[in-house]
């Protein structure tokens, strides 16, 4: 090389990160072969659960505002569990990125994009509680599944915008010990006349902006909807129903508990640029809080079902319905296998044009979803015990 | 071929001025960053200064904080190194040196030596 | 600050000695560490970056290794031209602190 050939300019923290070397010490052998194994157990537990929960929510429900926010909730999860596959490669093959610089980009942007619409989502579901209750007329006339869906293309639209400086300042770079890194550069695009001023500017404000928009704000929202939801159902002289507490701290605590290391953690490795003594912690830290926050995308399925006796009950059914169809004899099909089969799709066509995933059920409505986000459980929107509160006090 | 040059050092009184210059050629000097680094006769090196590529970080020892200011100007390809408050121990020869990427200095000036004496 | 401390001071070897140059920091470094070569009259040269990176046009008899807070550097086999002091830099924390120097000279 040239001594004017100027080298891939890499910001300091990055630079030092290439320069780490790896150690084939027998406990962090041992260490890494455990990461892969819990990682591949969480890509194959991730793309199951949320499979079944879009299929269940999406095909076995009735359609109401509250399922729409589950199917997109679950389709975020689901695609960040698709890129956990990618993710346990990298593990297993020496923490080296593999795969190539577009779909470096690509997987991370994921992991961002399942950040934002996250936070976004979980915003939209305790505000629309919030309205069902503060303006329970408004939210009678103007509460569609149509409108939710318009709400989360908006949101979608928004978390892919926050995610393009992510996909944008991703990059691979080659470590000294022949690895390959999977990591931001913020000097790969128009780095300025000064680097140093970029790197601190642009790691500062990726790693704030994303703890406020993706963390900080949906916390706060979700934190004040629930505020108001507690004030005006105590003036109705309503006391909210115990389980309500109990579901909403359990999805908000999962999403602060597993987003919450990982954006405290960002926040200190952008502090790290000017205060390198930072470096070691956060480099030790952030791999693990990183898979912590891909973990939330395997837990919200565990919650809707431990939350939902009716979720859990309309699962073992749709499991059921397909098994049956799945190991039913050729043999049957003149018989009553097929009596079965003709009779729910007949009746499928008049609930849901997807004929295939649907079956007849009495309109019960969604799951009770997300805690105190969510009306009822095992009854209709009409009937749920809120809404029943809601009439009996505005009437 | 890269090329530093220092110039500015010399004689100067305890409590004296100086003020070294590094004129750089060969490479694209605004995209470096650059140090001084000094030795005393017959003693070990010391890093004295480090200034960013654009001129906006600066970094000193605590030896010489406070008291010496380095500085560049792109558009001349010259690095400075501004000396005030000048004791004995800051005798030395004074080399600019350019930073490889982050760190290690990968091209050093042939030096101009300080005499800080009464 | 970080200290660096260097062993030894100075060593007299023959041609095609194998010599081997240590360099201890007073806490981890991270590979953070470079050495030098220089030659009585003349500027420093860059020898190794980032611990154990030879750098442009050295040799390749030269080379580096270590981690932590121990770094060697070693000449498998000792020339004429390699009659110089040595010193070990770290780049961790500023203030980025040299060695004292390693003179070696000729037995």
């Known amino acids: 090389m040239s001594a004017n050939a100027t080298l891939k300019p890499l910001c300091p923290i990055l630079e030092q990160m290439s320069r780490l070397q790896s150690h084939s010490n027998t406990s962090i052998r041992y260490i890494d072969h455990a990461a892969v194994l819990l990682h591949g157990l969480a890509s194959l537990l991730g793309l199951v659960e949320n499979g079944v929960i879009l299929f269940v929510v999406g095909c076995r429900m009735r359609q109401t505002v509250v399922t729409t926010w589950v199917l997109h909730l679950a389709l975020s999860d689901l695609l960040a569990s698709a890129s956990l596959p990618f993710f346990t490669y990298f593990l297993a093959v020496g923490h080296s990125w593999e795969l190539g610089t577009t779909f470096c980009k690509l997987h991370s942007s994921i992991f961002f994009l399942n950040m934002f619409a996250s936070g976004f989502l979980l915003s939209a579901i305790s505000l629309d509680r919030c309205l069902q209750v503060v303006r329970p007329v408004w939210a009678q006339n103007h509460r569609t599944v149509a409108a939710a869906h318009k709400v989360c293309l908006v949101l979608w639209a928004l978390a892919v915008l926050n995610t393009v400086p992510y996909f944008v300042f991703r990059d691979t770079i080659s470590r000294l010990d022949g690895r390959i890194m999977c990591y931001y550069n913020v000097l790969l695009l128009n780095p300025g006349p000064d680097r140093d001023a970029t790197c601190n500017s642009r790691q500062v404000a990726l790693a704030v902006s994303k703890f406020l928009l993706a963390f900080l704000v949906p916390l706060a929202i979700i934190a004040s909807s629930h505020a108001a939801v507690s004030l005006r159902l105590q003036h109705r002289g309503r006391r909210r129903p115990g389980r309500f507490v109990r579901l909403v701290a359990a999805v908000v605590a999962a999403f602060a508990l597993c987003w919450g290391p990982y954006h405290v953690f960002s926040l200190l490795e952008a502090r790290a640029h000017a205060n390198p003594g930072l470096r070691p912690l956060v480099w030790r830290g952030l791999p693990f809080v990183t898979s912590l926050a891909f973990f939330n995308s395997v837990a919200n399925p565990v919650l809707y079902v431990l939350t939902c006796p009716d979720m859990l009950r309309k699962l073992r059914r749709s499991l059921r319905t397909v098994l049956e169809s799945v190991l039913v004899d050729d043999s049957e099909l003149g018989g009553a296998g097929s009596s079965r089969r003709r009779r729910t799709s007949s009746t499928a066509r008049s609930a849901s044009p997807l004929a295939l995933c649907s079956r007849p059920e009495e309109p019960r409505g969604p799951a009770r979803l997300l805690g105190w986000l969510l009306g009822s459980c095992a009854a209709s929107p009409q009937t749920g015990p809120l809404n029943r509160a809601l009439s009996s006090t505005s009437s | 071929e890269v090329q530093l040059v220092e110039s500015g050092g010399g004689l100067v009184q305890p409590g004296g001025s100086l003020r070294l210059s590094c004129a750089a050629s060969g490479f694209t000097f605004s995209s470096y960053l650059m140090s001084w680094v000094r030795q005393a006769p017959g003693k070990g090196l010391e890093w004295v200064a480090r200034i960013s590529n654009g001129g906006s970080t600066t970094d000193y020892p605590g030896t010489v904080e406070g008291r010496f200011t380095i500085s560049r100007d792109n558009s001349k390809n010259t690095l400075y190194l501004q000396m005030n408050s000048l004791r004995a121990e800051d005798t030395a020869v004074y080399y600019c040196?350019?930073?490889?990427?982050?760190?290690?200095?990968?091209?050093w000036g042939q030096g101009t030596l300080v005499t800080v004496s009464s | 600050d970080i200290q660096m401390t260097q062993s030894p001071s100075s060593l007299s070897a023959s041609v095609g000695d194998r010599v081997t140059i240590t360099c201890r920091a007073s806490e981890n470094i991270y590979y953070n560490l470079a050495w030098y070569q220089q030659k009585p009259g003349k500027a420093p040269k860059l020898l190794i970056y980032?611990?154990?990176q030879l750098a442009d046009g050295v040799p390749s008899r030269f080379s580096g290794s270590g981690s932590g807070t121990d770094y060697t550097l070693t000449i498998s086999s000792l020339q004429p031209e390699d009659f110089a002091t040595y010193y070990c830099q770290h780049f961790w924390i500023t203030p980025w602190t040299f060695g004292q120097g390693t003179k070696v000279e000729i037995k």
């Open positions: 040196a350019r930073h490889r990427t982050n760190w290690d200095f990968d091209y």
């Open positions: 980032a611990a154990t």
